[in-house]
């Protein structure tokens, strides 16, 4: 007889023991349930201690299920981040390797005496991409200024060029356009490309960070009670075979995860913005085309300077006066050979297209992560009833679950029959993460328009915690920011694991 089997508490004993609890706690037969604090107070197989143990266990199980779901999402975002980051860094490293391999032959000492300047430029581009707080346009402008100074000295070894003369040369530079169109073109294209690449990768970092932080938000005591009632009270009340009614489960988890669901709107905005910015990865100003071809703009610039040398010198003398000549110095340098240019457009490798299409698909898949979480957990982790509605566990007994399913988010839980939710007290950690999502979305939208938003300024917006032949062979003309006093520190969302210190290397 099933009723007598239930009354003997055998099934409860089995389930309770399987969870690792001591069987000595379990009564042999049902007892009166006045002592129960969470489950309905009918006849029961659960003592107070059992109820407390099962309540703690159900709480822990839900937190584990939540963390598991979050971990899957985090892993996906981390894999995406790594893939894109590897690809973008590879493009820049390839460009630098090509420069180091081809420039000595193409430009001789015009390159070797200034190799340090080029190395520094690539280092700064790397730092910028990784999220350092430096101004890319200024970095490029200073690079060209230093390079002009060094190359001008190299091209005129017979002249005495003291600091004040070089200062004058620097002031004339913008009007003289000594490097032709290359600096302007590189500035326009590189700014757009690097801003797009770095903001996309930072977006993945922020998304992952948000998921990690939200997964650590503890479930409140009201949620714990409701989850116990949902999962284990049927056992205590002698109907261990009854599985939770689907709508009942949804209401419990919508109440428990009300704050998390409030991430939905800004989460969608962020993912939409990330998908949108991938449009900027293509074309002549696209990430692949530009980041992989920095060296060709540099080659073009040196060629332009050589072609314009005589005109440039005449204009500099006109603006800055006749410099003194070193009587022991040689004559002016012979015109050097033009560096042979590699084609500017890198043929697309197909790698980026594949990465982008995978990313778009995966980002679309997780767009409704936060609002679908209650449904997902109910169907995947809670062993819901598939029986007809009147045979499932409704929190009181086996039978139909009548209340309507609540809407998503905190405000909609005002009348949640299963979890008492104080809608006037939103969770502060989750509010902070909503702010982080907003900030990153704004950054991506600016990046889409080719603008860089100072990341540190942005992250102060509200949340608190968001989630460094001119002379020496390859020494001269080092582009290091003179004008900007900003110290180049990693930002709130500089790429995870890529701190500024990684820039350290020895030549």
């Amino acid at each position: 007889d099933p009723a007598s089997k239930s009354r003997s508490c055998g099934e409860v004993r089995q389930i309770y023991g399987a969870k690792g609890f001591s069987l000595s706690d379990v009564p042999q037969a049902e007892i009166s349930g006045e002592h129960l604090r969470i489950c309905p107070q009918g006849y029961t197989c659960c003592t107070s201690e059992m109820e407390e143990n099962l309540a703690n266990r159900s709480h822990a199980e839900l937190e584990t299920a939540l963390r598991d779901s979050s971990r899957v999402l985090q892993a996906m975002l981390a894999t995406q981040l790594r893939s894109f980051d590897d690809h973008f860094q590879h493009l820049l490293n390839d460009s630098e390797r090509t420069l180091q391999a081809t420039f000595p032959g193409a430009f001789g000492e015009l390159y070797t005496q200034n190799a340090r300047a080029f190395r520094d430029l690539y280092s700064e581009l790397r730092l910028y991409y990784r999220g350092a707080n430096l101004h890319l346009e200024e970095t490029l402008a200073e690079f060209w200024a230093r390079l002009l100074e060094r190359l001008f000295k190299q091209l005129h070894p017979q002249l005495l060029l003291p600091d004040d003369y070089l200062d004058c040369l620097g002031k004339q530079a913008e009007a003289l356009r000594p490097f032709g169109e290359a600096p302007r073109e590189l500035r326009l294209r590189a700014t757009r490309a690097f801003v797009a690449a770095r903001s996309f990768v930072q977006g993945l970092g922020v998304a992952s960070d948000v998921v990690r932080k939200v997964a650590q938000v503890p479930l409140g005591p009201e949620c714990s009670r409701a989850v116990m009632k949902l999962v284990y009270c049927a056992h205590c009340l002698g109907v261990p075979g009854a599985r939770p009614c689907p709508d009942y489960c949804r209401n419990v988890l919508k109440g428990c995860l009300a704050n998390q669901a409030d991430l939905d709107a800004e989460w969608r905005n962020l993912l939409d913005s990330m998908v949108l910015i991938t449009d900027k990865f293509w074309g002549t100003s696209g990430v692949e085309s530009v980041i992989g071809s920095v060296h060709t703009w540099l080659a073009e610039a040196i060629n332009a300077l050589q072609d314009n040398r005589d005109t440039l010198t005449a204009k500099v003398i006109q603006g800055c006066g006749n410099p003194k000549v070193n009587p022991q110095g040689p004559g002016p340098e012979e015109k050097r050979r033009r560096g042979k240019l590699a084609p500017r457009e890198r043929p697309p490798s197909g790698t980026l297209e594949k990465l982008v299409s995978e990313a778009k698909a995966q980002l679309r898949d997780v767009q409704d992560f936060w609002i679908s979480l209650p449904g997902t957990l109910c169907s995947e982790k809670m062993a819901l009833s598939t029986a007809s509605d009147d045979r499932c566990w409704n929190g009181m007994a086996r039978g139909r679950y009548l209340p309507e399913v609540m809407g998503d988010g905190l405000a909609n839980q005002i009348n949640n029959p299963e979890v008492e939710v104080d809608i006037t007290k939103p969770d502060m950690t989750i509010r902070q993460q909503i702010m982080q999502l907003k900030i990153m979305t704004n950054r991506l939208r600016s990046a889409y328009n080719g603008n860089d938003v100072d990341f540190q300024d942005a992250s102060d917006d509200g949340s608190g915690s968001g989630s460094g032949d001119g002379c020496l062979d390859d020494l001269c003309s080092r582009k290091v920011s003179r004008k900007s006093s900003s110290s180049r520190t990693p930002l709130t969302h500089a790429l995870p694991g890529l701190s500024e210190q990684e820039g350290q290397k020895t030549s």
Epitope: A117, R119, D120, S123, E124, L127, L134, R146, E149, R150, K153, P157, L160, L161, P162, D163, L166, N326, G329, G468, D469, G470, C471, L472, D473, D474, L475, C476, S477, R478, K479, V480, S481, R482, K483, S484, S485, S486, S487, R488, E500, Q501, G503, Q504, K505, T506, S507
Partner: antibody
Framework: QVQLVQSGAEVKKPGASVKVSCKAS????????MHWVRQAPGQGLEWMGE????????TYNQKFKARVTMTRDTSTSTVYMELSSLRSEDTAVYYC????????????WGQGTLVTVSS | NIQMTQSPSSLSASVGDRVTITCQAS??????LNWYQQRPGKAPQLLIY???NLERGVPSRFSGSGFGTDFTLTISSVQPEDFATYYC?????????FGGGTKVEIK
């Protein structure tokens, strides 16, 4: 005005390490390379290496490469030079020196830090 | 490595004398040559950069010349404060190297 202030004198045992600091002020710290030059008692000047405070990139004199590490802290505008496996011949005054304008010309020098290596 | 050879290693002069110090590089260094003065117990001070450019604030009695491998520092009329050690330094290639120094003493 540009100032480079170095840490105080140190006495070390052979085999130990020493870390000398150089705090910069009066200019944009990330704007100029910083070099380290040493001078043994009664001897000439010897270049040890340099660091780009903006990127952290370093170039060392091959002679010291295995033992020297140069780092920087942009938040305090300070560069550091650490020399390990000290021997008696490392007894010297260690100077930090800032470049003039990206050209290997040392226009500004720290006051020097005497490091004595003795058992 | 580029060797820098200074001569003489020391010299004696009286106030008002003209003093010439030479520096020879083991290979062509164009005009990437700098001169420093070091007084006892003090840090070196830049005098001349780029072989012949006078650093701001340095008296005009100091001058530099040369190109390629041979360079000269001249003090046209030595003053009491000029008695010190002088070093040349090449800034053409790594490692940066200094000459052995020339000590200018009072006769």
């Amino acid at each position: 005005q540009v100032q480079l202030v170095q840490s105080g004198a140190e006495v070390k045992k052979p085999g130990a390490s020493v870390k000398v600091s150089c705090k910069a002020s009066g200019y944009t710290f990330t704007g100029y390379y910083m070099h380290w030059v040493r001078q043994a008692p009664g001897q000439g000047l010897e270049w040890m290496g340099e660091i780009n405070p903006s990127t952290g990139d370093t170039t060392y004199n091959q002679k010291f490469k295995a033992r020297v590490t140069m780092t920087r802290d942009t938040s305090t505008s300070t560069v550091y030079m650490e020399l390990s496996s000290l021997r008696s011949e490392d007894t010297a005054v260690y100077y930090c020196a800032r470049e003039k304008r990206d050209d290997g010309v040392f226009a500004y020098w720290g006051q020097g830090t005497l490091v004595t290596v003795s058992s | 490595n580029i060797q820098m050879t200074q001569s003489p290693s020391s010299l004696s002069a009286s106030v008002g004398d003209r003093v010439t110090i030479t520096c020879q590089a083991s290979q062509d260094i164009s005009n990437y040559l700098n001169w420093y003065q070091q007084r006892p117990g003090k840090a070196p001070q830049l005098l001349i950069y780029g072989a012949s450019n006078l650093e701001r604030g340095v008296p005009s009695r100091f001058s530099g010349s040369g190109f390629g491998t041979d360079f000269t520092l001249t003090i046209s009329s030595v003053q009491p404060e000029d008695f010190a050690t002088y070093y040349c330094q090449q800034a053409k290639s790594y490692p940066l190297t200094f000459g052995g120094g020339t000590k200018v003493e009072i006769k």
